[in-house]
């Protein structure tokens, strides 16, 4: 997150981190039920760990943290790397969470977001596009949903109904390491961090997010059948 601010501890209890090795964060994720996460399909890796209930970027133990393995990764069938359409994936964890003030699921929005809606995006991704700077703790950023027209003007030929754009003035954006993390609007999960221009946080090049209202049925059906 570029030019966000430290999230309040436990204010984003659905925020997850996908880790490689002992503690290398490569993507965010969102807890949507006691045993299921959503993330971006492009975050798929054969082996990874899941961390919930953690505030700090560092691996220091926190009392609220819970660690999991992913036992099933189910990318949306319409996703095709390296395209950006249908960029979502369900992850089934090896066990259910212990519900606590630090770890709670978020409800997915059934209605699509409208232009001007204020939302919050969060993550432990880079705080500048030099790709070296990481935050000490989870970052939060208020962003505004942009019109479809403005979104398509920003990225001609690259936007479809499985995406929406959101941003703020130049210098505020999600960035590398935030993928798969939550965009929460009015208390409901509206999107996942997906893509945007490189470097992050450029004028007229907003963040692009997976439009979850288009996938509510697929998410429910997939969880029920697995």
């Amino acid at each position: 997150i570029v030019n966000g601010s430290d999230c309040q501890k436990d204010a984003q209890p659905w925020q997850g981190a996908l880790l490689l090795g002992p503690n290398k964060l490569y993507c965010g994720a969102v807890l949507i039920s006691p045993q299921w996460l959503l993330t971006a399909a492009h975050c798929r890796k054969p082996v990874f760990r899941i961390r919930l209930g953690h505030h700090s970027m560092s691996p220091v133990y926190e009392s609220g943290q819970q660690m999991f393995q992913g036992i099933k990764s189910i990318p949306h069938p319409g996703y095709s790397h390296p395209g950006h359409s249908n960029d979502l994936m369900l992850i089934k964890m090896n066990r259910k969470i212990r519900d606590s003030h630090s770890v709670k699921p978020v409800e997915i929005a059934c209605d699509c977001a409208t232009e001007g809606t204020r939302c919050m995006v969060s993550g432990w991704g880079t705080t500048s596009s030099s790709h070296n700077n990481f935050p000490k703790v989870l970052q939060c950023l208020n962003i505004t949903v942009l019109s479809e027209e403005r979104c398509k003007n920003s990225y001609p030929g690259q936007i479809d109904k499985t995406m929406f754009c959101a941003g703020d003035e130049e210098g505020r954006d999600s960035c590398q390491g935030d993928s798969g993390g939550p965009v929460v609007c009015n208390g409901k999960l509206q999107g996942l961090v997906s893509w945007g221009d490189f470097p992050c946080a450029q004028r007229n090049r907003p963040g692009v997010y997976t439009n979850l209202c288009e996938f509510v049925k697929w998410i429910k059906d997939t969880m029920n059948s697995n």
Partner: antibody
Framework: EVQLVESGGGLVQPGGSLRLSCAAS????????MNWVRQAPGKGLEWVSY????????DYADSVKGRFTISRDNAKNSLYLQMNSLRAEDTAVYYC???????????????????WGQGTTVTVSS | DIQMTQSPSSVSASVGDRVTITCRAS??????LAWYQQKPGKAPKLLIY???SLQSGVPSRFSGSGSGTDFTLTISSLQPEDFATYYC?????????FGGGTKVEIK
């Protein structure tokens, strides 16, 4: 078959210009960032330039900045390198290479260059 | 710019030998290192990405390890087709930089 084929190399005098081309086939070219990498005779690999999938981000090695220009035409599945003010030290085999890292995606994960052309030779000599 | 230093610059080995090549970055690059193999007159070939992940089609005798600034490429049992020059490359930060190369020669 995924393939990159370079062309446009040749002998040029110092101060002269050349335009290299790289024709891509067998994959969706518009989805991938691309690079030019060169190798002087008997030397190691040197990265020259990078262009993102949509051409929105471009970068160059200091040794070629202001003299070389990278571009692409996604409709033609082609990558280009315009080389001006050529010097003797630009003599090398020039490779185009596909970058597996999608820098538009906002994951923190980096790969490398997975597909390379056969190279085209540029000789700068009087 | 990040400097990549490879050692040794050349190594003589026999078929069946275990060969280890090291690469050091001038600043931390986490696990974001690639290894390439290049044979004379040919283009480089990606062997390993993300320090330890084997590229599709690459034999399992090749392995990579390391994180931060120090990395290693190991060929567990050298085969005749492995005699080549090997390069490391840091991939997260522009400008991309390569190591100077390690030539693996027949003893």
């Amino acid at each position: 078959e995924v393939q990159l084929v370079e062309s446009g190399g040749g002998l040029v005098q110092p101060g002269g210009s050349l335009r290299l081309s790289c024709a891509a086939s067998g994959f969706t070219f518009e989805h991938y960032s691309m690079n030019w990498v060169r190798q002087a005779p008997g030397k190691g690999l040197e990265w020259v330039s990078y262009i993102s999938s949509s051409s929105s981000y471009i970068d160059y090695a200091d040794s070629v900045k202001g003299r070389f220009t990278i571009s692409r035409d996604n409709a033609k599945n082609s990558l280009y390198l315009q080389m001006n003010s050529l010097r003797a030290e630009d003599t090398a085999v020039y490779y185009c290479a596909r970058d597996l890292t999608d820098r538009q995606s906002r994951d923190y994960y980096y790969y490398g260059m997975d597909v390379w052309g056969q190279g085209t030779t540029v000789t700068v000599s009087s | 710019d990040i400097q990549m230093t490879q050692s040794p610059s050349s190594v003589s080995a026999s078929v069946g030998d275990r060969v280890t090549i090291t690469c050091r970055a001038s600043q931390g690059i986490s696990s974001w290192l690639a290894w390439y193999q290049q044979k004379p007159g040919k283009a480089p070939k990606l062997l390993i990405y993300a320090a330890s992940s084997l590229q599709s089609g690459v034999p399992s005798r090749f392995s990579g390890s390391g994180s931060g600034t120090d990395f290693t490429l190991t060929i567990s049992s050298l085969q005749p087709e492995d005699f080549a020059t090997y390069y490391c490359q840091q991939v997260p930060i522009f400008p991309y930089t390569f190591g100077g190369g390690t030539k693996v020669e027949i003893k």
